[in-house]
Interface confidence: low
């Protein structure tokens, strides 16, 4: 599923991401834009053999099990395929664990490079939330 910007903002808000660990909803929508272009089925292979999955590009080395990543920790205790669902519950629940891990949203390279320090509220402007 490819979400619309406001559609995703509403879904993320419903799942409790607004101001989760101090990060406003705009941060999460911005991260999803530059990680996956709002596509729940996005996958990208990394040079270390791991793969990033889903709308927030969650990594199989640490967070989910795809049965194919050597030394996977599966800290979210989910199959990576769950992160590709059009239902973003699994991605949001895992993202909450990631953002609580110590580095906050810096765990997402795209957020760090494209969203951090910018006007992230622009990503939810005009949305009826």
């Amino acid at each position: 599923k490819v979400f619309g910007r406001c559609e995703l903002a509403a879904a993320m808000k419903r799942h409790g991401l607004d101001n989760y660990r101090g990060y406003s909803l705009g941060n999460w929508v911005c991260a999803a834009k530059f990680e996956s272009n709002f596509n729940t089925q996005a996958t990208n292979r990394n040079t270390d053999g791991s793969t990033d999955y889903g709308i927030l590009q969650i990594n199989s080395r640490w967070w989910c099990n795809d049965g194919r990543t050597p030394g996977s920790r599966n800290l979210c205790n989910i199959p990576c395929s769950a992160l590709l669902s059009s239902d973003i519950t699994a991605s949001v629940n895992c993202a909450k664990k990631i953002v609580s891990d110590g580095n906050g949203m810096n765990a997402w390279v795209a957020w760090r490079n494209r969203c951090k320090g910018t006007d992230v509220q622009a990503w939810i402007r005009g949305c009826r939330l």
């Epitope: 795809d66 049965g67 050597p70 395929s81």
Partner: antibody, heavy 115, light 107 residues
Framework: QVQLQESGAEVMKPGASVKISCKAT????????IEWVKQRPGHGLEWIGE????????YYNEKFKGKATFTADTSSNTAYMQLSSLTSEDSAVYYC?????????WGQGTTLTVS | DIELTQSPATLSVTPGDSVSLSCRAS??????LHWYQQKSHESPRLLIK???QSMSGIPSRFSGSGSGTDFTLSINSVETEDFGMYFC?????????FGGGTKLEIK
């Protein structure tokens, strides 16, 4: 139960192209990789590459880049592999398998003869 | 690419014998090694995943061991239905690679 059903045997002329199909049933097609494997007598098993049907992401063994092209039709739960510019070296049995790092579920194989 | 070398190429045994098949990787692959059985004109069948985890429905006489670069598939008291080809496969890196196979035949 999970099943992978491949298309039937093909006899092709050198230089032609062929498209082999692999229809998946019994699981969520979009969220598991479909792998393609080649087997020639005396050459063992060779991994050609893989496709994740839901996203269309593909990864190819360098050896098969330009030879194999993967596609998938999520409306019919079918993965395809097209082989182009066929030569006698492409004569083999081609398998699809569901990818989990290891391959528990396999198709029955499609025999391709190029002559 | 990671090369997997299986030995011996052919193993001739009598039913009831116990045998060991070897698979050696060109570099360390941790425990990311899987074993398949293939009979003539059939698709491969997964016996053991991740070095030592037996698949459901596979007889207990099949077991796997090893780590790093050296792996072994053991068959305790071979039965006639066990004859065929055996392949190892690594999932430590891409491209996935298979060993050349060991043919288990009746003496």
């Amino acid at each position: 139960q999970v099943q992978l059903q491949e298309s039937g045997a093909e006899v092709m002329k050198p230089g032609a192209s062929v498209k082999i199909s692999c229809k998946a049933t019994g699981y969520t097609f979009t969220t598991y990789w479909i792998e393609w494997v080649k087997q020639r007598p005396g050459h063992g098993l060779e991994w050609i590459g893989e496709i994740l049907p839901g996203s269309g992401s593909t990864y190819y063994n360098e050896k098969f880049k330009g030879k194999a092209t993967f596609t998938a039709d999520t409306s019919s739960n079918t993965a395809y592999m097209q082989l182009s510019s066929l030569t006698s070296e492409d004569s083999a049995v081609y398998y699809c398998a569901r990818g989990d790092g290891h391959y528990y579920y396999w198709g029955q194989g499609t025999t391709l003869t190029v002559s | 690419d990671i090369e997997l070398t299986q030995s011996p190429a052919t193993l001739s045994v009598t039913p009831g014998d116990s045998v060991s098949l070897s698979c050696r990787a060109s570099q360390s692959i941790s425990n990311n090694l899987h074993w398949y059985q293939q009979k003539s004109h059939e698709s491969p069948r997964l016996l053991i995943k991740y070095t030592s985890q037996s698949m459901s429905g596979i007889p207990s006489r099949f077991s796997g061991s090893g780590s790093g670069t050296d792996f072994t598939l053991s068959i305790n008291s071979v039965e006639t239905e066990d004859f065929g080809m055996y392949f190892c496969q690594q999932s430590n890196s891409w491209p996935r690679t298979f060993g050349g196979g060991t043919k288990l035949e009746i003496k």
